[in-house]
């Protein structure tokens, strides 16, 4: 009679994570008598997966009834597969011995490959806000996928970006992989409503890529422009001066009025108007009692936007003559003042 052979008909098996893997194995003879064991890997460090004779293997079930005397099918099923299960599985026939069974013959092995979906891409931007015309870096990360082949693309408002670098780790063989990509994005003044999108395509996603997004509203700071103007006289001794704060983002803004360098009033932007591009406008006014001043008054609108150093714009109010409509002009002091004008 021909010597027993252990047949593993499948050189490789590909299974999606979470599914059940079937590893087939048949023997060509009932002799010699002895159990079958399944191992992952070969050599002294191999891992026991299933032992017909003894042990508890909750994830493993046999395809046929191994208790039947004439059974020669030793195929197994492994449930709830994860990338950690990837490897080469060997079906090994043992010959009954005393005191221990002796390894008799091994199958050629079946390589189990696990297809695992990538995690949802996570996109993160710079630690602090940046202003228009600057290039900032965004990162995209996705983990736990297998096989290694993966495609990553970047978009800004639907337009594909080309300035990015991508790494898939580890470089060598692994049960699962991670992808890390860094894209450079140029901010514009119109980017408050913009989005940066990282798109990951993988064989496990069946043509439906995963996307991670970052809103540039979290990244951009659009500095305001300031304009101080004097309004027509309200009453004989009163002048209304307005400070227009335009095109700023985010909304966090505090405005201080100074009269000849002394704080007159401080307020926080609340009832702002929103522009189509997502930036804000705000106006503050100051009623100045001209009769309370002997000399010309230097009015300064000082703005602190989003925690940045304060910026200001000044207006000289002439009180020597009867107040009338005036335009903004520069200080007639001996040296530049300590306020910094935005323009």
């Amino acid at each position: 009679e021909e010597e027993l052979q252990v047949i593993q008909p499948d050189k490789s098996v590909l299974v999606a994570a979470g599914e059940t893997a079937t590893l087939r194995c048949t023997a060509t003879s009932l002799i010699p008598v002895g159990p079958i064991q399944w191992f992952r890997g070969a050599g002294p460090g191999r891992e026991l997966i299933y032992n017909q004779k003894e042990g508890h293997f909750p994830r493993v079930t046999t395809v046929s009834d191994l208790t039947k005397r004439n059974n020669m099918d030793f195929s197994i099923r492994i449930g709830n597969i994860t990338p950690a299960d990837a490897g080469t599985y060997y079906c090994v026939k043992f010959r009954k011995g005393s005191p221990d069974d002796v390894e008799f013959k091994s199958g050629a092995g079946t390589e189990l490959s696990v297809r695992a979906k990538p995690s949802a891409p996570v996109v993160s931007g710079p630690a602090a806000r940046a202003t228009p015309q600057h290039t900032v870096s965004f990162t995209c990360e996705s983990h736990g996928f297998s096989p290694r082949d993966i495609t990553l693309k970047w978009f800004k408002n639907g337009n594909e970006l080309s300035d990015f670098q991508t790494n898939v780790d580890p470089v060598g063989e692994s049960v699962s992989y991670s992808i890390h990509s860094t894209a450079k994005v140029v901010l514009t003044r119109e980017d408050v409503h913009s989005q940066v999108i990282c798109e990951v395509a993988h064989v496990t996603l069946q043509g439906d890529p995963l996307r991670g997004t970052a809103n540039l509203s979290e990244t951009i700071r659009v500095p305001p422009t300031l304009e101080v103007t004097q309004q027509p006289v309200r009453a004989e001794n009163q002048v209304n001066v307005t400070c227009q704060v335009r095109k700023f983002y985010p909304q966090r803004l505090q405005l201080t009025w100074l009269e000849n360098g002394n704080v007159s009033r401080t307020e926080t932007a609340s009832t702002v108007t929103e522009n189509k591009d997502g930036t804000y406008n705000w106006m503050s006014w100051l009623l100045v009692n001209v009769s309370a001043h002997r000399d010309d008054v230097k009015l300064t609108c000082q703005v602190e936007h989003d925690g940045q150093p304060a910026v200001s714009k000044s207006h000289d109010l002439k009180v020597s003559a009867h107040p009338k409509e005036q335009g903004s002009n520069t200080a007639a002091e001996n040296t530049g003042s300590n306020e910094r004008n935005i323009y």
Partner: antibody
Framework: QVQLVQSGAEVKKPGASVKVSCKAS????????IHWVRQAPGQGLEWMGD????????ANNQKFKGRVTMTRDTSTSTVYMELSSLRSEDTAVYYC????????????WGQGTLVTVSS | DIQMTQSPSSLSASVGDRVTITCKAS??????VAWYQQKPGKAPKLLIY???SLETGVLSRFSGSGSGTDFTLTISSLQAEDFATYYC?????????FGGGTKVEIK
């Protein structure tokens, strides 16, 4: 008081790279951009680019076609400007200067670093 | 890139003279214009920013004006320490650009 202190003069061969440092003090480093401006002997001023230490955001003069790399080390309040593939026409004094992002011109300047490119 | 055309490239003047330097931008740059003074072997010094705002510590004989594309630096009464080279610069859009400079020399 606000100070920007630059590294010392350098002599480089064509094709080499140079890295100039600019150490800031006297203000909150992450609130202001650091700009780089160069001036060839007897010539005018030329803006190279800037970096915002807070966000790491950079703006570059495309004339330099990727030869300029600006980095920052917030732990030492230092900005670095590296210029690669040097040629003789890169011989110049290189200045760093600070500005409030999006608002102001350059109000404080470093003392300048002379970079000489010669074979 | 925005071109900043500065004129004249040089001028000779005497102490006490009123000096005017002009700068023309190739496109609208709003009010984002600065003026610098540079003396030989020194870094530039900011005089005016935002077209007309005097930098802290700068004497009031320096003034700036203009808007849109046309800008002017005026020294009302030239002093001995004012002989230097002056540059205009736009900071509305990158790349930031400078004028070619105006060298103010003693007549």
């Amino acid at each position: 008081q606000v100070q920007l202190v630059q590294s010392g003069a350098e002599v480089k061969k064509p094709g080499a790279s140079v890295k100039v440092s600019c150490k800031a003090s006297g203000y909150t480093f992450t609130d202001y951009e650091i700009h780089w401006v160069r001036q060839a002997p007897g010539q005018g001023l030329e803006w190279m680019g800037d970096i915002h230490p807070g966000s790491g955001g950079t703006a570059n003069n495309q004339k330099f076609k990727g030869r300029v790399t600006m980095t920052r080390d917030t732990s030492t309040s230092t900005v670095y400007m590296e210029l690669s593939s040097l040629r003789s026409e890169d011989t110049a004094v290189y200045y760093c200067a600070r500005a409030v992002s999006g608002y102001y011109a350059m109000d404080y300047w470093g003392q300048g670093t002379l970079v000489t490119v010669s074979s | 890139d925005i071109q900043m055309t500065q004129s004249p490239s040089s001028l000779s003047a005497s102490v006490g003279d009123r000096v005017t330097i002009t700068c023309k931008a190739s496109e609208d740059i709003y009010d984002r214009v600065a003026w610098y003074q540079q003396k030989p072997g020194k870094a530039p010094k900011l005089l005016i920013y935002g077209t007309a705002s005097l930098e802290t510590g700068v004497l009031s004989r320096f003034s700036g004006s203009g808007s849109g594309t046309d800008f002017t630096l005026t020294i009302s009464s030239l002093q001995a320490e004012d002989f230097a080279t002056y540059y205009c610069q736009q900071y509305w859009t990158t790349p930031w650009t400078f004028g070619g400079g105006t060298k103010v020399e003693i007549k």
